[in-house]
Amino acid sequence: EPHSLRYNLMVLSQDGSVQSGFLAEGHLDGQPFLRYDRQKRRAKPQGQWAEDVLGAKTWDTETEDLTENGQDLRRTLTHIKDQKGGLHSLQEIRVCEIHEDSSTRGSRHFYYDGELFLSQNLETQESTVPQSSRAQTLAMNVTNFWKEDAMKTKTHYRAMQADCLQKLQRYLKSGVAIRRTVPPMVNVTCSEVSEGNITVTCRASSFYPRNITLTWRQDGVSLSHNTQQWGDVLPDGNGTYQTWVATRIRQGEEQRFTCYMEHSGNHGTHPVPSGKALVLQSQRTDHHHHHHGLNDIFEAQKIEWHE
């Protein structure tokens, strides 16, 4: 996987009036490392690992850059014509990557009310607009505004990409994203019985890197895909990842099932706990995809955050 730096910014408008401030978070190699504190108007480290390794200067620079980007995004939102009453959002995702062969990529993507309407390649300055008429209108609206804005020149895009790559290289050198291996903790639980079946869930947590194989086996043979339910591999906020896989089995056949895990050349099989006590003690788990971070405002305003 390439090394990547990603910034996620969002501005909101209520009944045609653009709200002050913005929301932002940053990801390094897919791990959250930065969050923007709206109250204090400062970029702050997210996770102990970012706090330990990146110095105060980093957060000063990130605060300045994000403030500028946030202002740009707010100005862009004011120029979106079709704003009806209610709450609206404009989101920008900016990514730069360094690949193994040292080649680089850079792009940014814009979403209005959670819908993608414009993608730009920061290296070629090529734009891609989805087919929908709404996306076409929004993209035209925004690009017309940028044409009037002297800042949005080709030079500006190149500088944007160069700045992002510079930061990425600096962060990588500082060792935030050192390619260490952290083996997963694996935990198997059972939910309550229904019609003679139990749901067994295998959770892997606190592992790095993110690539993992987690699958249920019956008698040592992998169950077919359609009999298993997988969770996304998500950052857990500590520089490591978590995921799960679940399946339904007949009560009394627990000993035939194992959860097989493979991660960074290591592997293991984990049996289903047997016995009534273990089946009943574990609470039922509803598996939802949780979006991490920024939940204070998103929970209140139910804005969809694209990751």
Epitope: Q218, D219, R256
Partner: antibody
Framework: QVQLKQSGPELVKPGASVKVSCKAS????????IYWVKQSHGKSLEWIGY????????VQNQKFKGKATLTVDKSSSTAYMHLNSLTSEDSAVYYC???????????WGQGTLVTVSS | DIVLTQSPTTMAASPGEKITITCSAS???????LHWYQQKPGFSPKLLIY???NLASGVPARFSGSGSGTSYSLTIGTMEAEDVATYYC?????????FGSGTKLEIK
């Protein structure tokens, strides 16, 4: 490539016991189960049981409980089946097999002939 | 225990002939749990078809499998001399795993 090499033929007296070995190579031993199957002369196949080499967990055919004990030695990538209180009924070829994770008995050992005779 | 009944018990076929061997289960099993093995005289069994219809690695395309529920079959499109062997079906649906009694295929 995956190989399962079993120990040589055994001639044992009734009431005695025997330990059949199955040495695995060509893959990570603790990744896949080892299964044991019996084939009496000119007869069909009977599943005895299996062992998970990673954690030593076993599942057995009720018919062979008390007759066969399955163990592994991870350090030598070897699985063992210990057969006790042997009678003429136990005279058979015993096979070990392993899986590729998609079908049960994907790879087989060459078999070990156990003859119980006084 | 699930009993698997194979038929015929023995059969002789000419080269080029189409062969079908059936396997009937005493209770319904999912197609994911039915496998076929070939055992040539003096050798260990060899996986032929897994999960009812998937050819194991290195198995010629003239072999095929089908079925569901309690009724399964193995077909050899065109019999060849090297196919002389005993064929076994096997279920992995419930413990204990069981094998069919075998079908001995000979050449005319």
């Amino acid at each position: 490539q995956v190989q399962l090499k079993q120990s040589g033929p055994e001639l044992v007296k009734p009431g005695a016991s025997v330990k059949v070995s199955c040495k695995a190579s060509g893959y990570a031993f603790t990744k896949y189960n080892i299964y044991w199957v019996k084939q009496s002369h000119g007869k069909s196949l009977e599943w005895i049981g299996y062992i998970d080499p990673y954690n030593g967990g076993t599942v057995q055919n009720q018919k062979f409980k008390g007759k066969a004990t399955l163990t592994v030695d991870k350090s030598s990538s070897t699985a063992y089946m210990h057969l006790n209180s042997l009678t003429s009924e136990d005279s058979a070829v015993y096979y070990c097999a392993t899986t590729d994770g998609y079908s049960l008995f994907t790879y087989w050992g060459q078999g070990t002939l156990v003859t119980v005779s006084s | 225990d699930i009993v698997l009944t194979q038929s015929p018990t023995t059969m002789a076929a000419s080269p080029g002939e189409k062969i079908t061997i059936t396997c009937s289960a005493s209770s319904s099993i999912s197609s994911n749990y039915l496998h076929w093995y070939q055992q040539k005289p003096g050798f260990s069994p060899k996986l032929l078809i897994y999960r009812t219809s998937n050819l194991a690695s290195g198995v010629p395309a003239r072999f095929s499998g089908s079925g569901s529920g309690t009724s399964y079959s193995l077909t050899i499109g065109t019999m060849e001399a090297e196919d002389v062997a005993t064929y076994y079906c096997q279920q992995g649906s419930s413990i204990p795993f069981t094998f069919g009694s075998g079908t001995k295929l000979e050449i005319k």
